[in-house]
Amino acid sequence: QRLPRMQEDSPLGGGSSGEDDPLGEEDLPSEEDSPREEDPPGEEDLPGEEDLPGEEDLPEVKPKSEEEGSLKLEDLPTVEAPGDPQEPQNNAHRDKEGDDQSHWRYGGDPPWPRVSPACAGRFQSPVDIRPQLAAFCPALRPLELLGFQLPPLPELRLRNNGHSVQLTLPPGLEMALGPGREYRALQLHLHWGAAGRPGSEHTVEGHRFPAEIHVVHLSTAFARVDEALGRPGGLAVLAAFLEEGPEENSAYEQLLSRLEEIAEEGSETQVPGLDISALLPSDFSRYFQYEGSLTTPPCAQGVIWTVFNQTVMLSAKQLHTLSDTLWGPGDSRLQLNFRATQPLNGRVIEASFPAGVDSSPRAAEPVQLNSCLAAGD
């Protein structure tokens, strides 16, 4: 089943942070406020509104056998995520155990730029992706992944670090964004919402997905993460949206079935090695790409973001397990661990496929396609 193609003229959730609406630095959202009733995390933030820092996702994936029936981003309806009528999850608490307020958190003090000034930068992540405004770049070739199918041994560390669930990856997982753009995978983590509330970091035409997986990579040009921070292309993140589907995702279940063991903040367990690529969509050829930042302090810029067009399907039960099992700081549930979308400030999102082509009669005006800057230039 394919959903109708998204329309260029569909309204975003309250405002645009697209390429055609660059904002000045003074309009950058701050990280300091927790979600408000009238500003549910599921909706696109207005430019200039306070940012809702958000949570991270766990890797969940669509079985390769379902590839044909999988959802594509350009097929999604342009409906805004409904606001949650219940009170928003309050993550802006003071830790009952005496948390040092200088350490960052999702929602609440301190403002992220106080933790790291880079969080007030002009080219931050996540962003709202508007396929109609993406620049089609034929030079963006299919992603290449090597060594992602791990044997059961050695086991991998799965950890609840209070901000997300994180799987540490061993040496040897190689990824190429293109010729001469080679990376090594370091770790993966997830961002999610809460019951009835989506929690992806990136959005598409204002639509927020239930969850999002991030696989973080270090350029082979650098030996250590610290050397790469803030350097263009020093870090690269593969991101995929997680959606609800009818069947259990067996790849994700290998991780989700272990979350109970790491329910407490700071706890960890060992899990058998698995096929990491099975946590990602099967179509490595269709994706969006832009230069942004880490989505948490230190918010270092120069990060190459690659967001898959194809989504990964998990069962409703699996998505519930993801959002309702872990605990974070101060005896609160680890939920809504996502940052609000940030203004593009003139950045152009590139697409490896013609995402802006729309044959629908609803498109009243011609689509203005942005020009492509060839990858590697």
């Epitope: 005496g98 200088s102 350490h103 670090n161 901000h163 370091l186 770790q187």
Partner: nanobody, 116 residues
């Protein structure tokens, strides 16, 4: 962003005590969980104990009741008090700081040898 330097290792007799320290520098406010891990010769690195900013602690079963992890945020220092040491505690002990996106930061390690 974050630098970690361990100290306090050495040779101690079975049943003795040692206190390890880990001095953290850089932007440590990006870190939520810190911990101690150890690696014995020919073995995988394993968890010893972790502590969150809020003071929540976790211990490996093998050290529960003998080791205590603590942190002094005012001094940016992580500690591991090790009592009732056994020969099997002999290992290189590493300080760790974990970031949601950047992953693990590690110190250079300090050797603890328990022998009579």
């Amino acid at each position: 962003q974050v630098q970690l330097v361990e100290s306090g290792g050495g040779l101690v007799q079975p049943g003795g005590s040692l206190r390890l320290s880990c001095a953290a520098s850089g932007n440590i406010f990006i870190i939520n969980v810190m911990g101690w891990y150890r690696q014995a010769p020919g073995k995988q690195r394993e968890l010893v104990a972790t502590i969150t900013n809020g003071g929540r602690t976790h211990y490996a079963d093998s050290v529960k009741g003998r080791f205590t992890i603590s942190r002094d945020n005012s001094k940016n220092t992580l500690y591991l008090q090790m009592n009732s040491l056994r020969a099997e505690d002999t290992a290189v002990y590493y300080c760790n700081a974990n970031h949601i996106e950047l992953g693990d930061y590690w110190g250079q390690g300090t050797l603890v040898t328990v022998s009579s």
